[in-house]
Interface confidence: low
């Protein structure tokens, strides 16, 4: 798999989990979120050569269409595969809220 | 929807529809597949910028931290969405088969 | 192989500036934050702050804040500390530091041994 | 600010089991790490992620966390094993920490 446990460890061009540290009020401007201050949302990037890690058929057929004819601007694109919540605390006035965003954190990419 | 309905009619460089024919000799060197003897795969490309169809709450946070941060490399991608499947007709020996090659067909894409 | 090679001695009077190098070899350098490091004499580490160089984040420690800015150069696979006005309390051994998503360094340089004194 | 504690300094007898803790608020929540730092030399990640092991490091080394408290265990404990034992971690902001270091001896 695509995730932390592989990527974080081998130095991979192709596509692969990222690290990405978002801090919520200097990265996406929300001021609304107490805690936490920020969070590793990591992101998917790198190429995706013929049969690396495809996530359909179709896009085996793109990377092979791609590998084919290389010129061509279609080609499968690396993309988050597994995602997690994050759960947060804000406040409504002075009424603490704890909630958990859902599809927040990456934790492995495909190509799709 | 990131459809044909609308990506086609429409001059779009953000993330849509894109139309492409995969013949399957030429651009795929298959030389098993009677027929048909292509057929349209399409695929999806464009820019993803800030809530232009996003698929899940990390690649809307992904949009935003890369308008914020316009450096990074960290930003969503356009991808396929729903796809179809596609029948072919080939040859064992001398006897034909038909099969339903899922996911060979896309309809609409999304940022993710 | 991975390494981390950073600039020489250096030996500074209070007020001067000062800027120290860690460049990176033997791995993609913008896929790995690098973080900086500080040992007093006789004292522990002391995390001082990292740098994503994929994407120019910066983070520091609040003991540090405002004393130190870290930058990176990816062309040439080089992250930076600098210190406009030094002290003589910023005599110490820095490490620089390969780090992992989730906080763990697993690769150092050999360290710069900066020496502040009148 | 987050704060990791240490014991100031842990003894052995050589071939014995060392354990050095490390406490932290939730740290069990936490990613930590060890690192081993002997005179003159760069740090040197022993365990990572809780108790997982760098390539070159020995079994000897083991990790486990839980609760408020890490703990890294060196059996048959070796004369090369004398060295400064630093956990690491960090708070919700990936703010980094460290502990305060632990000097152990291994005695004989």
């Known amino acids: 798999a695509l995730d932390a446990a592989y990527c974080f460890r081998n130095v991979q061009d192709n596509c692969c989990l990222r690290p990405l540290y978002i801090d919520f009020k200097r990265d996406l401007g929300w001021k609304w979120i107490h805690e936490p201050k920020g969070y590793n949302a990591n992101f998917c990037a790198g190429a995706c050569p013929y049969l690396w890690s495809s996530d359909t058929q179709h896009s085996r057929v793109l990377s092979l269409y791609n590998t084919i004819n290389p010129e061509a601007s279609a080609s499968p694109c690396c993309v988050s595969q597994d995602l997690e919540p994050l759960t947060i605390l804000y406040y409504i006035g002075k009424t603490p809220k704890i909630e958990q965003l859902s599809n927040m954190i990456v934790k492995s990419c495909k190509c799709s | 929807a990131l459809d044909a309905a609308y990506c086609f009619r429409n001059v779009q460089d953000n993330c849509c529809l894109r139309p492409l024919y995969i013949d399957f000799k030429r651009d795929l060197g298959w030389k098993w597949i009677h027929e048909p003897k292509g057929y349209n795969a399409n695929f999806c490309a464009g820019a993803c910028p800030y809530l232009w169809s996003s698929d899940t709450q990390h690649s809307r946070v992904l949009s935003l931290y890369n308008t914020i941060n316009p450096e990074a490399s960290a930003s969503p991608c356009c991808v396929s969405q729903d796809l179809e499947p596609l029948t072919i007709l080939y040859y064992i020996g001398k006897t034909p088969k038909i099969e339903q090659l899922s996911n060979m067909i896309v309809k609409s894409c999304k940022c993710s | 192989q991975v390494q981390l090679v950073q600039s020489g001695a250096e030996v500074k009077k209070p007020g001067e500036s000062l800027k120290i190098s860690c460049k990176g070899s033997g791995y993609s350098f913008t896929r790995y934050y690098v973080a900086w490091v500080r040992q007093m004499p006789g004292k522990g580490l002391e995390w001082m702050g990292w740098i994503d160089p994929g994407q120019s984040n910066t983070r520091y420690s609040p003991s540090f804040q405002g004393q130190v800015t870290i930058s990176a150069d990816k062309s040439i696979s080089t992250a930076y500390l600098q210190w406009s006005s030094l002290k003589a309390s910023d005599t110490a051994m820095y490490y620089c530091?390969?780090?992992?998503?989730?906080?763990?360094?697993?690769?150092w340089g050999q360290g710069t041994l900066v020496t502040v004194s009148s | 600010s987050y704060e990791l504690t240490q014991p100031l300094s842990v003894s052995v007898a050589l071939g014995q089991t060392a354990r050095i803790t490390c406490s932290g608020d939730n740290l069990g929540g936490y990613y930590a790490h060890w690192y081993q730092q002997k005179p003159g030399q760069a740090p040197v990640l022993v365990i990572y992620d809780k108790s997982d092991r760098p390539s070159g490091i020995p079994e000897r080394f083991s990790g486990s966390n839980s609760g408020n408290t890490a703990t890294l265990t060196i059996s048959r404990a070796q004369a090369g094993d004398e060295a400064d034992y630093y956990c690491a971690s960090y708070d919700s902001s990936l703010m980094m920490v460290f502990g305060g270091g632990t000097k152990l001896t291994v005695l004989g």
């Open positions: 530091a390969r780090m992992l998503a989730w906080g763990w360094f697993d690769y």
